[in-house]
């Protein structure tokens, strides 16, 4: 009886109904179910479609723009549980822009274990006020149910029996009102005694066994559950998986060979993104948690001694990184078994993304090739790379190869970075902004000095467009206020003073003094530094009275440390030799100033002579806060308080409405009208600042959700149509 059909992987069904038939034998969807973007479907297309075997979805159910679908009562008549193991933007059930949906109709839905419900912008959707969500999920206050037909009070929701003057459905209390609960005009909401909690009950209200979740065919029997509260094992619901079983996907017990098969299936497949499952804490999980590494003999995760190695074996012995996406496939790798070819021509926020994905690599067994990576300014994103073994070499016996990288200015900060190249030579050609001094420094540090032959490092095509003879610029004057820093530095003039076009001042917030020039920079416009162009000062013929160039930095944050450096901007000379100067990075902190106001003050009186005041620290302390000043003043009592007849019938008790914290404008208008005088003499009050702010927050929240939805559901068409059914993770 428990889960009579198959366990199916997560599904994304879009464009047409063809793939919907894959649900036919599914009892459990291990993952999410998304049905979306069907613009040509009509009501009759759904008439004979039903998936009565589907009992549980482990992640979330999302319905978005499916035309013609008017109810889910026939489609998923037995869907009982949505576990919400993984959520869609905090939601386990999302019904969004379903233009023809008239009712939900999920009349067997008894439990949403985690997450809440978002039902929004469904112009025809009724039977929402008749559902008591508190019987289905815990976090009702996080539900977001707005902009549906139900909001406009146009729904004539009639529960079964009402038309004949009977009340067939259970009534529950919301806002002190007893309301009949139903999903459709022919289906009541099943309500169990509250003592049954989420275990469910029989038709007579007898509680299911406490290992059940949502429903059962008989009470007190863990083999008669419709779904399990904890884990499923051999037709029975159990609290925990006994040896020799392992917990899998938070809902079922599997044996070692099941987990091992998943591991090997992924290992032997060429599919990206599958998981080589491992065993940890009696669970079969996609990968070892941080601090653990897999013991290949038994798949067990064992604690690492020091940082965990993660050896990544490259198919065909090498991998080309040509985008952030391909870099993500190496996320977490510490040892690359093979060779890397970096060929990045563009992208967004590249330096940070590359560091996030490649920054843990410590060792490459083969060679490293940087080729036509116009977007790279530095290789510092390989933050931990310490060893290139050169066990396989690029043609010509090269273990490090840099060719035609138009914007590469720095390899690593050699004062902070050690790199050993065990065997093989260096190759540098056509790197116009990379100074030869930087390359020679690499020879020394990496131990490759003397290995290179004459043409391995081109003297004419490396650094030919860079300021390579850098002198050191020194700051001569620094003055701070709370929002400004005034800087001056020693003058610099190249041999031909007309070559000096000016100075570039670089600065950024730097809480720690560990910044390097090329952090966060790429050639595609991403730059964590703010850059100011400064004209050269007037040149004096008297060297003793030279003007010191400088700049007043304005609009800074108080009590904030900034990293600052300055460098010259000089013209490119005909002799292929460019001069220039640059300062070291200095750190300067702005002064403190008045803090912003303390946040969220709350006052409560706990006795006739005491008031307790609480608040949160200001969002901008602008310094070290040492104390707060509290002012108070006695105010006259409002005489109205004494004169008011508190027994007046017009007074209403404050009550929480059933809808979520953020209400639609329509419902706000409706709420206001409730408090208007029946004679119609009073007009509604103007919105308070907090109401306006709340509306702005709601609008922003709505936009954020929509952006997230669109980013997730709109994906480029794939050329192949593989379903990925062999991967037990959601597709």
């Amino acid at each position: 009886h428990l889960y009579p059909g198959e366990v199916c992987p997560g599904m994304d069904i879009r464009n047409n109904l063809t793939r919907l038939h894959e649900l036919e034998n599914c009892s459990v969807i291990e993952g999410h179910l998304q049905i979306l973007l069907m613009f040509k479907t009509r009501p009759e297309d759904f008439r004979d479609l039903s998936f009565p075997k589907l009992i549980m979805i482990t992640d979330y159910l999302l319905l978005f723009r499916v035309y013609g679908l008017e109810s889910l009562k026939d489609l998923f008549p037995n869907l009982t549980v949505i576990r919400g193991s993984r959520l869609f933007f905090n939601y386990a059930l999302v019904i969004f822009e379903m233009v023809h949906l008239k009712e939900l109709g999920l009349y067997n839905l008894m439990n949403i274990t985690r997450g809440s419900v978002r039902i929004e912008k469904n112009n025809e959707l009724c039977y929402l006020a008749t559902i008591d969500w508190s019987r289905i999920l815990d976090s009702v206050e996080d539900n977001y149910i707005v902009l549906n037909k139900d909001d406009n009070e146009e729904c004539g929701d009639i529960c079964p029996g009402t038309a004949k003057g009977k009340t067939n459905c259970p009534a529950t209390v919301i806002n002190g009102q007893f309301v009949e609960r139903c999903w459709t005009h022919s289906h009541c909401q099943k309500v169990c005694p509250t003592i049954c909690k989420s275990h469910g009950c029989t038709a007579e209200g007898l509680c299911c066994h406490s290992e059940c979740l949502g429903n059962c065919s008989q009470p007190d029997d863990p083999t008669k559950c419709v779904a399990c509260r904890n884990f499923y094992l051999d037709g029975r619901c159990v609290e925990t998986c006994p040896p020799p079983y392992y917990h899998f996907q938070d809902w079922r017990c599997v044996n070692f060979s099941f987990c091992q098969d998943l591991h090997h299936k992924c290992k032997n497949s060429r599919r990206q993104g599958c998981h080589q499952y491992v065993i940890h804490n009696n669970k079969c999980i996609p990968e070892c948690p941080s601090g653990y590494t897999m013991n290949s003999s038994n798949l067990l995760c064992t604690p690492c001694l020091g940082p965990c190695p993660k050896v990544c074996h490259l198919l065909e012995g090498e991998k080309t990184i040509d985008s952030v996406t391909s870099a993500q496939e190496l996320r977490g790798c510490t040892v690359i078994n093979g060779s890397l070819i970096i060929n990045i021509r563009g992208g967004n926020n590249l330096a940070a993304e590359l560091e996030a994905n490649l920054g843990l690599i410590e060792e490459i067994s083969g060679y490293l090739k940087i080729r036509r990576s116009y977007a790279l300014v530095s290789l510092s994103f390989f933050r931990k790379l310490r060893l290139i073994r050169g066990e396989t070499l690029e043609i010509g016996n090269y273990s490090f190869y840099a060719l035609d990288n138009q914007n590469l200015r720095q390899l690593w900060d050699w004062s902070k970075h050690n790199l050993t190249i065990t065997q093989g030579k260096l190759f540098f050609h056509y790197n116009p902004k990379l100074c030869l001094s930087e390359i020679h420094k690499m020879e020394e540090v990496s131990g490759t000095k003397g290995r290179q032959e004459r043409n391995d490092i081109a003297l004419k095509t490396n650094g030919d467009q860079a300021s390579c003879e850098n002198e050191l610029l020194k700051f001569s004057y620094i003055r701070t206020s709370f929002d400004k820093i005034l800087l001056r530095w020693e003058p610099y003039w190249p041999p031909d003073f007309r070559d000096l076009l000016g100075f570039m001042l670089f600065y950024k917030e730097a809480p720690y003094q560990n910044v390097t020039e090329f952090d966060g920079q790429d050639a595609c416009g991403s730059n964590s530094w703010t850059v100011v162009d400064i004209d050269p000062p007037l040149r004096s013929n008297d060297p003793k009275s030279q003007n010191h160039p400088g700049w007043l930095m304005r609009g800074l944050k108080p009590w904030t440390q900034y990293a600052i450096f300055v460098k010259t901007l000089v013209t490119f000379s005909d002799e292929r030799r460019t001069y220039g100067a640059k300062s070291d990075i200095i750190y300067v902190q702005t002064d403190a100033t008045n803090p912003s106001v303390p946040l969220d003050p709350i006052s409560v009186s706990n006795s006739s002579s005491q008031i307790i005041l609480k608040w949160k620290p200001p969002s901008d302390p602008n310094g070290n806060i040492t104390h707060y000043l509290v002012f108070w003043e006695r105010q006259a009592e409002d005489s109205e308080l004494f004169e008011l007849d508190y027994c007046l019938k017009g007074l209403k008790l404050p009550s929480r409405t059933w809808s979520p914290p953020f209400e639609s404008e329509d419902s706000q208008k409706h709420n206001q009208s409730e408090y208007e005088d029946s004679a119609g003499e009073c007009c509604s009050c103007p919105k308070t600042d907090s109401q306006i702010l709340k509306e702005l927050e709601e609008s922003s929240f709505r936009k954020t959700f929509e952006d997230y939805l669109h980013n997730v559901v709109f994906v480029p068409r794939k050329t192949s149509s593989g379903t990925g059914a062999e991967d037990p993770r959601p597709s």
Partner: antibody, heavy 118, light 107 residues
Framework: EVQLVESGGGVVQPGGSLRLSCAAS????????MTWVRQAPGKGLEWVAN????????HYVDSVKGRFTISRDNAKNSLYLQMNSLRGEDTAVYYC???????????WGQGTLVTVSS | DIQMTQSPSSLSASVGDRVTITCRAS??????LAWYQQKPGKAPKLLIY???SLQSGVPSRFSGSGSGTDFTLTISSLQPEDFATYYC?????????FGQGTRLEIK
């Protein structure tokens, strides 16, 4: 045949303690909620406490919270009620009952009398 | 807590009579109500659960009805062995509570 047999009742002074036991047979004990109900002499029934199948969920009437503890041992098919800080108003016949679907008490023991008196 | 009030507290009837006992809950309890019969010196016996479902082995002359706050136990034709005290019990929420009882005596 389903059988529930209570034991452990007796006379105890106010402030004293007693431990009641209920031995179950004739059904799969570990599949059912179990309950204690009491009846003061000449009075009606009062639900005291219940416990779910694996002992992870327990509920008590307010008047005994913090003083009484319900527990079970599924391996021994036994239900227990540890009663501490006993008061005069705790004097009653204590019944152990099986909760069908948690709340329909379909089988009861014969009861054991607890008398709290100085 | 949900209070359960039975009426009448006691009643006299003759064999063959049709008898109705009512039970009122202080708040709605849907159909989550049970009826018990107790004879002197004996443990209670379950008659009806879920307001109207007859417990197996209980004679069909016993029936229950009602939902929300008002419930009734009906004995269609009183038999000599039916003279006892009857209790209703709500199971909507903890603490589970019983009515004060209705004593059914021979007239």
């Amino acid at each position: 045949e389903v059988q529930l047999v209570e034991s452990g009742g007796g006379v105890v002074q106010p402030g004293g303690s007693l431990r009641l036991s209920c031995a179950a047979s004739g059904f799969t004990f570990s599949s059912y909620w179990m309950t204690w109900v009491r009846q003061a002499p000449g009075k009606g029934l009062e639900w005291v406490a219940n416990i779910n199948q694996d002992g992870s969920e327990k509920h008590y009437v307010d008047s005994v919270k913090g003083r009484f503890t319900i527990s079970r041992d599924n391996a021994k098919n036994s239900l227990y009620l540890q009663m501490n800080s006993l008061r005069g108003e705790d004097t009653a016949v204590y019944y152990c009952a099986r909760g069908r679907g948690a709340w329909a008490f379909d089988y009861w023991g014969q009861g054991t009398l607890v008398t709290v008196s100085s | 807590d949900i209070q359960m009030t039975q009426s009448p507290s006691s009643l006299s009837a003759s064999v063959g009579d049709r008898v109705t006992i009512t039970c009122r809950a202080s708040q709605g309890i849907s159909s989550w109500l049970a009826w018990y019969q107790q004879k002197p010196g004996k443990a209670p016996k379950l008659l009806i659960y879920a307001a109207s479902s007859l417990q197996s082995g209980v004679p069909s002359r016993f029936s229950g009805s009602g939902s929300g706050t008002d419930f009734t136990l009906t004995i269609s034709s009183l038999q000599p062995e039916d003279f006892a005290t009857y209790y209703c019990q709500q199971a909507n929420s903890f603490p589970i509570t019983f009515g004060q009882g209705t004593r059914l005596e021979i007239k």
